[in-house]
């Protein structure tokens, strides 16, 4: 006879799966906060900074009541993919001033990538419909100046921090509904 069958596959507890995703998101939120503070210390921001290529905010107090797990995970994954792309672009094209944020910016990129893989895994474990592969995004234009790179960094880290902050709250809320 062939090898004995392996142990029965235990279906994962969705709350536990979501818990570990919340932990990762919280951890990345803390990393982003520290890096944004570091950026502000080195290059104080004068007013607000926007970048048209960044995703628009997906969550607010009013949206919390109608949250559904598939929608939240799909949107969060799409937004974080965009931020990952922007962080990669920042490291490549941000100019010499932003090299002072290494290796922290590289660590942030790696952790963002890890959270994205965790979200992908969570979606497959919960048997949620997988989003279609992302269409190739148009390349981001290099900053027009060193100051342009710094302004972009403020916008990217600020936007990522806000997205992660709402993500933690949304995921915590969804956990209670499972």
């Amino acid at each position: 006879p062939g090898p004995p069958p392996g142990p029965p596959r235990v279906s994962p507890d969705p709350r536990a799966e979501l818990d570990s995703t919340v932990l990762l998101t919280r951890s990345l939120l803390a990393d982003t906060r520290q890096l944004a503070a570091q950026l502000r210390d080195k290059f104080p921001a004068d007013g607000d900074h926007n970048l048209d290529s960044l995703p628009t905010l997906a969550m607010s107090a009013g949206a919390l009541g109608a949250l559904q797990l598939p929608g939240v995970l799909t949107r969060l994954r799409a937004d974080l993919l965009s931020y990952l792309r922007h962080v990669q672009w920042l490291r490549r094209a941000g100019g010499s001033s932003l090299k002072t944020l290494e290796p922290e910016l590289g660590t942030l990129q790696a952790r963002l990538d890890r959270l994205l893989r965790r979200l992908q895994l969570l979606m497959s474990r919960l048997a949620l419909p997988q989003p279609p592969p992302d269409p190739p995004a148009p390349p981001l234009a290099p900053p027009s100046s060193a100051w342009g790179g710094i302004r972009a960094a403020h916008a990217i880290l600020g936007g990522l921090h806000l997205t992660l902050d709402w993500a933690v709250r949304g995921l915590l809320l969804l956990k209670t509904r499972l």
């Epitope: 107090a61 806000l162 915590l172």
Partner: antibody, heavy 117, light 110 residues
Amino acid sequence: EVQLLESGGGLVQPGGSLRLSCAASGFTFSHYDMNWLRQAPGKGLEWVGVISYDASNKFYADFVKGRFTISRDNSKNTLYLQMNSLRAEDTAVYYCARTPGSHFDYWGQGTLVTVSS
Amino acid sequence: QSVLTQPPSASGTPGQRVTISCSGSSSNIGNNAVNWYQQLPGTAPKLLIYYDDLLPSGVPDRFSGSKSGTSASLAISGLRSEDEADYYCSAWDDSLNGVVFGGGTKLTVL
């Protein structure tokens, strides 16, 4: 630097109205939900209500429902609190505060509202 | 009567560690993030801890937060005279559909 500056407080008679403003600067106002909170003299903090970043949703504490209205003008980076049918127990320092998720990460310095005849 | 329950006062001597408790229910602390605010005399409140145990930038790591079930606590180690203030816990409440606070704890540094 994030700054929130309340104005419009003062002395008003019971049953009267008052409109508070909160001028925001140093951040992208239109990205953040905004709140009003209050603190009666010598008492604790009390949440009044929240308005979503795009003004599409508002939530209020039970004690102000139907009397207070929160609004915002994103083009002017300003938050408002319209207070009607004021009572003596509404006497408090009123604060505006920014919400990035579940918490209030920046607060204004507050404006005092006194309801008395 | 506040929805979240805190001791009205706490005290300690410089260098000591003090803990402030905050208890609630499943509709607030049990299901939602707990935040802590510090209010120095005559000033506006300031965020001290968010999402149960995260520190905003600029807050010294002498401050820490924790949560278990429907209770949370704030710990301050290496107490300093400038820590003398009112401390408030807060959370969203699913039943009330709003933010609730504890009554505040007045911390005295002896």
